[in-house]
């Protein structure tokens, strides 16, 4: 008789999840010489230990602590790029501007990027059928707790000028319910962070509006200012040109506004 299995509202664990995490770890440590000492089997064991045999609605930050320890990494605190709803461009940017880091440029972020995972209470099985949805099922699920944990720690580590890339094409350019709006903004340390600089990325080619005047950006400014951190905002009217100019800053067309 097949065992009864909890049906959740979200997609199940990404297929070949263990193999994917292990392969990503190996690849990351090969690309980043300073992380070559990392034992990827231990990393996988710590990752697995955070959610296997545990109820997928009862995961805590403490469950991920062994993994956090193994993911110890140097990140220049003044070179941190946060993002919200515009991950691809943020990653394209740090691939060119190699001295800046998004969370997904760290080992822990790289391991989990775009993956889903969960287990089942009291069995060592990974649930490939369904996992809890943050809204419909529960917020303390393995994926949400992981990202909340690493995002909080990443924001805590930031200093000096912190940059955030925001999607100007969305109705809420700054969304209080995003990971940036609900976690990272509130974990920037005012004693370490002088300024949060928002880069608002325009979508339309003919869009010349000043999106830094958007009400949600003003809301972000208010939240940040109340935390005794300065706020600045820049429109990136042409993201394609922006990336091109990061690659080739000497280009004569790069002196004009982008």
């Amino acid at each position: 008789v097949p065992r009864w299995r909890q049906q959740w509202s979200g997609p199940g664990t990404t297929k070949r999840f263990p193999e994917t995490v292990l392969a990503r770890c190996v690849k990351y440590t090969e690309i980043h010489p300073e992380m070559r000492h990392v034992d990827c089997q231990s990393v996988w064991d710590a990752f697995k230990g955070a959610f296997i045999s545990k109820h997928p609605c009862n995961i805590t930050e403490e469950d991920y602590q062994p993994l956090m320890k193994l993911g110890t990494q140097t990140v220049p605190c003044n070179k941190i790029l946060l993002w919200s709803r515009i991950k691809d461009l943020a990653h394209q940017f740090t691939q060119v501007q190699r001295d800046m880091f998004t969370l997904e440029d760290t080992l822990l972020g790289y391991l989990a990027d775009d993956l889903t995972w969960c287990g089942e209470f009291n069995t060592s099985k990974i649930n490939y059928q369904s996992c809890p949805d943050w809204r419909k099922d529960c917020s303390n699920n393995p994926v949400s707790v992981f990202w909340k944990t690493v995002s909080r720690r990443f924001a805590e580590a930031a200093c000096d000028v912190v940059h955030v890339m925001l999607n100007g094409s969305r109705s809420k350019i700054f969304d209080k319910n995003s990971t940036f709006g609900s976690v990272e903004v509130h974990n920037l340390q005012p004693e370490k962070v002088q300024t949060l600089e928002a880069w608002v990325i325009h979508g339309g080619r003919e869009d010349s509006r000043d999106l830094c005047q958007d009400p949600t950006i003003k809301e972000l400014e208010s939240i940040i200012s109340k935390r005794n951190i300065q706020f600045s905002c820049k429109n990136i009217y042409r993201p394609d040109k922006f990336l091109q100019c990061v690659k080739n800053p000497e280009d004569s067309s790069c002196t004009s506004e982008i």
Partner: nanobody, 117 residues
């Protein structure tokens, strides 16, 4: 601006002891968890220990548990690491850093601990 200065390292025989200190400035020391991390020759960064801002909560890497003790004196803005029963594999440059990790940007020069007979 966060600034730290580590001291107390040196050459010690296996089984010996050392006490590292870290003088911090530029921030409200008691507001921040503090950590010790280390880097062995030719190796990557390894987390050693973390202590909460109040000093009431501590955590250690398995490799140093029972041998190392982290503490702090918030009135002196100073972090300590008492290292006992030292082993050759503890040889490393030790850095103190603000925060609990796993992402660190150590600001000091570090202090070299060499365990050798």
């Amino acid at each position: 601006e966060v600034q730290v200065l580590e001291s107390g390292g040196g050459l010690v025989q296996p089984g010996g002891s050392l006490r590292l200190s870290c003088a911090a400035s530029g921030f409200t020391f008691s507001n921040f968890a503090m950590s010790w991390v280390r880097q062995a020759p030719g190796k990557g960064l390894e987390w050693v220990s973390t202590i909460s801002g109040s000093g009431g909560s501590t955590d250690y890497a398995d490799s140093v548990k029972g041998r190392f003790t982290i503490s702090r004196d918030n009135s002196k803005n100073t972090l300590y690491l008492q290292m006992n029963s030292l082993r050759a594999e503890d040889t490393a440059v030790y850095y103190c850093a603000d925060g609990r990790g796993p992402f660190f940007d150590y600001r000091g020069q570090g202090t070299l601990v060499t365990v050798s007979s």
